[in-house]
Interface confidence: low
């Protein structure tokens, strides 16, 4: 079998062997080296000699193999368009951001670039949960049967209702989506009056 | 498009203080979550409070218990009550609805 090619050689059909971690150099018609992630061309290759490459400053980058002359600067996420720090830039990944709590992505191009507040889920619903949070705005749906949710809120989750049986006491009033079940004491008798009116 | 024009800053002595106004337009103000940011000389522009559709509020820890977002929706309009003010809240005050929108600020001085 052929002895495998080793930058730089030449090229006659424009390609190289491999994609990603070498180029063509249309000057000299040849494939050369790129540069691992992290690192920059601080020499460009010549027919006799490959790709010289070079660590990224601090505070710069390179994510990908290329044949950059500059490495990219690393940006900090921007808290006026709602994005937070989870994970700090290296040489090799630029800053990682994600919408603050409470804040949806509503704008991307490539990444994520601004965020908005989630809307609020009126009483009886709740937010749809979500594979990856801050993804998209909340969808409210319905509290299932037997639950409750009594807030404007873009994060409240319906709670079952209370069983007044488990406090030993008996229902006064039924549960509906927006509140919870209504107990009372069933040991003190209440005046004909005031029936159904003194409530634990 | 969004118009959003604030006003009520000014010039205050440490310890007093201002109600800043955000009047919205060409919006369904009520569907709209608020924020008021501030700008100081060279520095970043900062989020300072914020209230959401319903009312629930937010603030920064550096203005917690001085400042209050409030909110009007049949005047479209957004209140910022500053109180206790400090000469480092001295900054351009923006309201914004964090869907892009700026208005042009107002310029809060803290100075005696």
């Known amino acids: 079998s052929q002895p495998q090619a080793v930058p730089p050689y030449a090229s006659e059909n424009q390609t190289c062997r491999d994609q990603e971690k070498e180029y063509y150099e249309p000057q000299h018609r040849i494939c050369c080296s790129r540069c691992p992630p992290g690192t920059y061309v601080s020499a460009k290759c010549s027919r006799i000699r490959d790709t010289v490459c070079a660590t990224c400053a601090e505070n710069s980058y390179n994510e990908h193999w290329n044949y950059l002359t500059i490495c990219q600067l690393c940006r900090p996420c921007d808290p006026v368009m709602g994005l937070e720090e989870i994970a700090p830039c290296t040489s090799k990944r630029k800053t990682q951001c994600r919408c603050q709590p409470g804040m949806f992505c509503a704008a991307w191009a490539l990444e994520c670039t601004h965020c908005e507040l989630l809307s609020d889920c009126p009483p009886g619903t709740e937010a749809e949960l979500k594979d990856e949070v801050g993804k998209g705005n909340n969808h409210c749906v319905p509290c299932k049967a037997g639950h409750f949710q009594n807030t404007s809120s873009p994060s409240a989750r319906c709670q079952p209702h209370t069983r007044c049986e488990n406090q030993g006491l008996v229902e006064a009033a039924p549960g509906t989506a927006q509140s919870d079940t209504t107990c009372k004491n069933p040991l003190e008798p209440l005046p004909p009056e005031m029936s159904g009116t003194m409530l634990m | 498009e969004v118009q959003l024009v604030e006003s009520g800053g000014g010039l205050v002595q440490p310890g007093g203080s201002l109600r800043l106004s955000c009047k919205a337009s060409?919006?369904?103000?009520?569907?709209?979550?608020f924020g008021w940011y501030r700008q100081a000389p060279g520095k970043q522009r900062e989020l300072v409070a914020t209230?959401?559709?319903?009312?629930?509020?937010w603030y920064d820890v550096s203005v917690k218990g001085r400042f209050i977002i409030s909110r009007d929706n049949p005047e479209n309009t957004v209140y910022l009550q500053m109180n206790s003010l400090r000469p480092e809240d001295t900054a351009v005050y923006y309201c914004?609805?964090?869907?892009?929108?700026w208005g042009q600020g107002t310029l809060v001085t803290v100075s005696s």
């Open positions: 209230i959401s559709t319903a009312g629930l509020t």
């Open positions: 060409g919006t369904t103000f009520s569907d709209r979550a």
């Open positions: 914004n609805t964090f869907r892009g929108n």
